[in-house]
Amino acid sequence: VPEKSVRWCAVSEHEATKCQSFRDHMKSVLPSNGPSVACVKKASHLDCIRAIAANEADAVTLDAGLVYDAYLAPNNLKPVVAEFYGSKEDPQTFYYAVAVVKKDSDFQMNQLRGRKSCHTGLGRSAGWNIPIGLLYCDLPEPRKPLEKAVANFFSGSCVPCADGTDFPQLCQLCPGCGCSTLNQYFSYSGAFKCLKDGAGDVAFVKHSTIFENLANKADRDQYELLCLDNTRKSVDEYKDCHLARVPSHTVVARSVGGKEDLIWELLNQAQEHFGKDKSKEFQLFSSPHGKDLLFKDSAHGFLKVPPRMDAKMYLGYEYITAIRNLREGTCPEAPTDECKPVKWCALSHHERLKCDEWSVNSAGKIECESAETTEDCIAKIMNGEADAMSLDGGFVYIAGMCGLVPVLAENYNTPNPNCENTAEEGYFAVAVVKSSSDLTWDNLKGKKSCHTAVGRTAGWNIPMGLLYSKINHCRFDEFFSEGCAPGSEKNSSLCKLCMGPSPNLCEPNNKEGYYGYTGAFRCLVEKGDVAFVKHQTVPQNTGGKNPDAWAKNLKEEDYELLCLDGSRKSVQEPANCHLARAPNHAVVARKDKADCVQTLLLDQQRMFGSSVTDCSSNFCLFESKTKDLLFRDDTVCLAKLHDRNTYEKYLGEEYVKAVTNLRKCSTSPLLEACTF
């Protein structure tokens, strides 16, 4: 097979015919050294998935349910290109499955038992698989056959296409459960009509259904959405209140050696030449031979799926939970309202050791999961492999953009017993230099810089945000002669100063000696001209407070702070000489786990928090000999957030704006995936 050939998988005679036409037309418009199409015919989409996994084909377009099958081992395929609908300016690649209710009703998601339900049809995504998958563990046992369990859960339903003879309750609201538009309650509009008419109490539909059926806002205001956290929201807040986000139609390929760049090159060229209203002789999104061949007829074009986005992230935690529940039919033994152990995400093996010790001391209430980078940890929390971790503000922003929520804040200044209920203002991000140097904020160009890590608040977002507004470009590696900013491209000058050791050189975790606050300060001590850190870093690592060989003889007076007005001040004066105020680090979790995480952590800090005085013979949660493992070592307590429970409210408008501006310079593959 030529290197530049994409073997498209077709699942019927009609698809094979369209594929051949696709191949011939692409040949006519692409240069001979460009990508080409070859066609492989298989009996079903599942056969196509297997063929791609076995390297007998390269690509196929799948519905969400099949993307799930494609992702499962041993197939291990991943989404590479998404079809979009709507306009090019506002492309829709996902729809949201929602539960709609009338505003004047008073129940929540966890009170659906005994209500009347309206569904689009048996086995359909938004109308059945997702809601029933998410409710699966609340269904009465035995849960098989599923239809019987659902019939016994709701007091009456309309489930078009269900067997009304075997399961009459499923057809109670629409006698016969007709499987076409002859049934007034069939499909999306029908399920909504079932609710509107008062036949049912809840309708499981798409987010767009209510807008398509009620043009008038005043009419829409009579309805609300049920959210998974047992609250309600208005129907236009579907992005924050849905059962699952469902990808519409997606091209998948192998995770390794999958030709994703070639597939994108091919489809991007294809949409240019044969997309909507582009050509008379061949149309990518329609066919005389049948409906939805190779691609959906309703598609308007393609978007490249960001490389960091694997199938788990693409399908989303809720969707995967729903489908897995339905497919595997397994439920936790513990009642669902009981808190299971919280899985903490630890960065590399140093944090993992501390986490293990915590786990032993917590009697198993804490379990540990590891990842090599903060972004990998955030991804694990998103997909349910982990539950929580404490993050610098810069990563609270990324986590928030990825749907996670802040749960508790680290407090550094408030003494107990008021600590747990106090909202601190934050800490100062500072620029530290040696007293012996003549550096100021205005002559940093060409100097050697030390950063905690790319994407972190004091070490990156604040100083680089200020620098960006001065130099108006993102080439920070050209501004400084060299530096250490863990998480930079390995060949960048901002990795040149890092210490490693070798395979971990410039990695954004504790295996890199110059990572984090203490690491950035060490970089200044040993090699650099300026370090961007928190205001407490110098005092915490001088005067013998850090016993490590490189730090034990350091004196506080040998270091000074750079002020934005071009002056310098003592490290004792951060309030009058700082770059900006930074939000305290905070614990983040998935929304569904936030309450459990908060309850457990407040309990854990009562046992292992700063009230423990002898850390040499007791486990201490906020101690790791200046290395800030799991939490900052200067944490006094974890504090409740009260109403600051979203990332925007927690970080504050000013900081969010600063980080949003810096996104032009973003090197965060995760952020790119989460904003897709």
């Epitope: 010790e357 032993v360 040499s616």
Partner: nanobody
């Protein structure tokens, strides 16, 4: 700083038992948490079992019901009783008291456990 030395490993058939010991050079009575880790070739080192001074224990899911951790403060020794051994238990086993901090990559020689027929 207490030095720890592991012993008791060996070759055993699937279904067999072994008892690992970890002798400390000084008193372990003041040490809060002690644990056994293992590392199979090409794998990350993983927690097998841990025990606190008060006797609270924690086990990896893969060894629950088969392994038992205990400590004898009078003898300054940590133990791991391993029953119903499986081939996947093959690894070098290490003990730690976490006292060197989490940052220093100090581990003893460990003791090799091989489960094979």
């Amino acid at each position: 700083e207490v030095q720890l030395v592991e012993c008791g490993g060996g070759l055993v058939q699937p279904g067999g038992s072994l008892r690992l010991s970890c002798a400390a050079s000084g008193s372990i009575a003041g040490i809060n948490t002690m644990a056994w880790y293992r590392q199979a070739p090409g794998q990350q080192r993983e927690l097998v079992a841990g025990i606190t001074r008060s006797g609270s224990t924690k086990y990896a899911d893969s060894v629950k019901g088969r392994f038992t951790i205990s400590r004898d403060n009078a003898k300054n020794t940590l133990y791991l009783q391993m029953n119903s051994l499986k081939p996947e238990d093959t690894a070098v086993y290490y003990c730690t008291d976490y006292s060197r901090g989490y940052y220093q990559d100090y581990w003893g020689q460990g003791t090799q456990v091989t489960v094979s027929s």
